[in-house]
C-alpha cells in the first residue's frame, strides 16, 4: 500500500519537519521557523504553540513537534495539553469567581486545586467519627458503635498459637 501511495502521491515521501511544496513541483521544503509538521506528507506546517503570560515553556517547539506549556508557579494546568492555567488556592480553600474562599463548615479540600467536598458521613457505614474533620482534612471514621459495646474489643485479637508438631499453612 505504501508503495502504491508514493507512486500516486509524491508528497507521501516528505518526512516530518517538512511540507510538500505544490508551488515547486511537490518538493519537500523545511517548515519555516516557529512551525512544525509532526507527520510526513503534509501540505503545510502548523504554527507552534506560544507559551506566553501565565504559561511557560515545558518543551520547545521543534520542526517535528509542537511546543508544550505548563503553568507558572501559583497556577496549575487544566484541560487537554494544559490549554488553561487556573490559580492555585491553599489547602482548605476552593477557587470561586471572587477568588480563593475557605471551605464551608462540613467540607474540606486537601489540595491546592479543585473544590471543597463534604466530610465523609461515618454513620452511613454504621461507624463513628474517630477524628474530626477540618477544612483541610476529611473526618476519620472509627469502628462502629456496636464494636465498642461492653466486652467487645476494638483491638484485633492475636492470631491463635500453632499446636506443637503442626507446620505453617
Amino acid at each position: 500500500f505504501e508503495r502504491t501511495r508514493s507512486l500516486q502521491d509524491p508528497c507521501s515521501n516528505c518526512p516530518a519537519g517538512t511540507f510538500c511544496d505544490n508551488n515547486r513541483n511537490q518538493i519537500c521544503s523545511p517548515c519555516p521557523p516557529n512551525s512544525f509538521s509532526s507527520a510526513g506528507g503534509q501540505r503545510t506546517c502548523d504554527i507552534c504553540r506560544q507559551c506566553k503570560g501565565v504559561f511557560r515553556t515545558r518543551k520547545e517547539c521543534s520542526s517535528t513537534s509542537n511546543a508544550e506549556c505548563d503553568c507558572t508557579p501559583g497556577f496549575h494546568c487544566l484541560g487537554a495539553g494544559c490549554s488553561m492555567c487556573e490559580q492555585d488556592c491553599k489547602q482548605g480553600q476552593e477557587l470561586t469567581k471572587k477568588g480563593c474562599k475557605d471551605c464551608c463548615f462540613g467540607t474540606f479540600n486537601d489540595q491546592k486545586r479543585g473544590i471543597c467536598r463534604p466530610w465523609t458521613n461515618c454513620s452511613l457505614d454504621g461507624k463513628s467519627v474517630l477524628v474530626n474533620g477540618t477544612k483541610e482534612r476529611d473526618v476519620v471514621c472509627g469502628p462502629s458503635p456496636a464494636d465498642l459495646s461492653p466486652g467487645a474489643s476494638s483491638v484485633t485479637p492475636p492470631a491463635p498459637a500453632r499446636e506443637p508438631g503442626h507446620s505453617p499453612q
Epitope: F19, S29, P32, P33, N34, S35, T44, C45, D46, I47
Partner: nanobody
Framework: EVQLLESGGGLVQPGGSLRLSCAAS????????VGWVRQAPGKGLEWVSA????????YYAESVKGRFTISRDNAKNTLYLQMSSLRAEDTAVYYC???????????????RGQGTQVTVSS
C-alpha cells in the same frame, strides 16, 4: 506581483564576510515574516535566519548563530543578511523567503528570486 531580488553573493575565503541584500516589491517587508533559506549543492533547502512576528523576534539556525545577522531597512523595503566568519559549509545558493500563513491555519513559505550564490573557498 510579489517579487524578491537577491544580490551580494560571491566568492570569499574562509573567515571572510559578505552582506546579502533582498529588495522586495509587491508587498511591505515590515508587515511580513521574512528570512533567508539556502540550498547547498546536492542538499535540500535549509532555513538560515528569519525576522518573525513583524520584527518581534529573530531566528537563526544553530549552524550560523553568532556569525550571521539578519536586519531590514523598512524605508528601502530591503532585507539583509550580514555573514561573517564564513566556512566552506556555508557554500550555497541563498534565497530571500516570505513566510505564508494560510487561512486554514497552515504555514508554508514562498521564495520568488533566482537566489544569490555564495562560495566559500580558499
Amino acid at each position: 506581483e510579489v517579487q524578491l531580488l537577491e544580490s551580494g553573493g560571491g566568492l570569499v575565503q574562509p573567515g571572510g564576510s559578505l552582506r546579502l541584500s533582498c529588495a522586495a516589491s509587491g508587498f511591505t517587508l515590515s508587515a511580513e515574516d521574512v528570512g533567508w533559506v539556502r540550498q547547498a549543492p546536492g542538499k535540500g533547502l535549509e532555513w538560515v535566519s528569519a525576522i518573525l512576528d513583524f520584527g518581534g523576534s529573530t531566528y537563526y539556525a544553530e549552524s550560523v548563530k553568532g556569525r550571521f545577522t539578519i536586519s531590514r531597512d523598512n524605508a528601502k523595503n530591503t532585507l539583509y543578511l550580514q555573514m561573517s566568519s564564513l566556512r566552506a559549509e556555508d557554500t550555497a545558493v541563498y534565497y530571500c523567503a516570505r513566510v505564508v500563513y494560510h487561512a486554514g491555519g497552515g504555514v508554508t513559505f514562498d521564495y520568488r528570486g533566482q537566489g544569490t550564490q555564495v562560495t566559500v573557498s580558499s
